[in-house]
């Protein structure tokens, strides 16, 4: 992973008490909306609150949503695909049921 | 099965530092935060901070920003808290949680 | 003073409906922050009751429900049972304190 020094760039024994600066918040933050994060990141789930979390990358795993109402609620959510990147079942990845599937960011 | 399964009670003097660990199995390590949540006897429960099992990164409650590192090592899929400079009102139960399943505890008590 | 305030006791026969508040402010609970519900049995870690303001993990009956509204939350307990005696906290997060917060606990005690 990239080793930033805090969740919201501060000096590592910072506790972001402080709202000094109104910087875009940074992996780990705590968010309501992706506006409150910066770029690479969207606000999703992380059960106790909604934290910035990095947009999937090519080959990243990713979550393919069912049709609305078909799912329970994600307490563990993943970003969605980068610019370019859609989430597609994984070609090589064969299961004996379509639910299983693997699916990964892949190119358009 | 997700377990969370603490190192042992810990009876330190004043002054001194105590470091409590927390090994998980049953999922991906790297994947999740591990916040760590002290309860002293007969009183509620207070977050101290979490560290993000992947990259090492670390956000403290205000309070112990002074006396407390999170840390982890990957290779073992074990999470660690240290608290320094103990004082009597630090005896308290300390749990690890990865939010949604808990470690059961480990008691540290500060007497001289 | 506590973030999340709740009442430190209550009780109910069995059978009867309780209800615990969780009163919060315009920094945690009103500002659209999750609340999620533990409860804890003496000696034993916190476990999850009610999770992001009304949901329900597996294996927690539908006797429990929570809710939310503007500053505050609620758990309520339908059809109380002598094994639902225990210690119980809202949580949330604080975007003033940039900390997750508990609420002071609520000591629950079934009558007779």
């Known amino acids: 992973g990239n080793d930033h020094s805090t969740l919201d760039g501060y000096s590592r024994r910072t506790t972001l008490s402080s709202k000094m600066y109104h910087s875009k918040g940074q992996e780990g933050s705590v968010c309501l909306r992706s506006s409150d994060c910066a770029t690479g990141l969207c606000c999703a789930r992380h059960f106790w609150s909604k934290i910035c979390k990095p947009v999937l990358k090519e080959g990243q795993v990713c979550t393919k949503h069912r049709r609305k109402g078909s799912h329970g609620l994600e307490i563990f959510q993943r970003c969605y695909c980068g610019e370019g990147l859609s989430c597609r079942i994984q070609k090589d990845h064969h299961q004996a049921s379509n639910s299983s599937r693997l699916h990964t960011c892949q190119r358009h | 099965e997700v377990q969370l399964v603490q190192s042992g009670a810990e009876v330190k003097k004043p002054g001194a530092s105590v470091k409590v660990s927390c090994k998980a199995s049953g999922y991906t390590f790297t994947d999740y935060y591990i916040h760590w949540v002290r309860q002293a006897p007969g009183q509620g429960l207070e977050w101290m901070g979490w560290?993000?099992?992947?990259?090492?990164?670390?956000t403290y409650a205000q309070k112990f920003q002074a006396r407390v590192t999170m840390s982890r090592d990957t290779s073992s899929s074990t999470a660690y808290m240290e608290l320094s400079r103990l004082e009597s009102d630090d005896t308290a139960m300390y749990f690890c949680?990865?939010?949604?399943?808990w470690g059961k505890g480990t008691m540290v008590t500060v007497s001289s | 003073q506590a973030v999340l305030t709740q009442p430190s006791s209550v009780s109910g026969a069995p059978g009867q409906r309780v209800s615990i508040s969780c009163t919060g402010s315009s920094s945690n609970i009103g500002a659209a922050y999750d609340v999620h519900w533990y409860q804890q049995l003496p000696g034993t870690a916190p476990r999850l009751l009610i999770y992001?303001?009304?949901n329900r993990p597996s294996g927690v009956p539908d006797r429990f429900s929570g809710s939310k509204s503007g500053t505050s939350a609620s758990l309520v307990i339908a059809g109380l049972q002598a094994e639902d005696e225990a210690d119980y906290y809202c949580?949330?997060?604080?975007?003033?304190?940039?900390?997750?917060?508990f609420g002071t606990g609520t000591k629950l005690t079934v009558l007779g």
């Open positions: 949580q949330s997060y604080d975007n003033s304190l940039n900390a997750y917060v």
């Open positions: 560290i993000h099992s992947n990259s090492g990164a670390t």
């Open positions: 992001v303001n009304n």
């Open positions: 949680s990865r939010e949604d399943y």
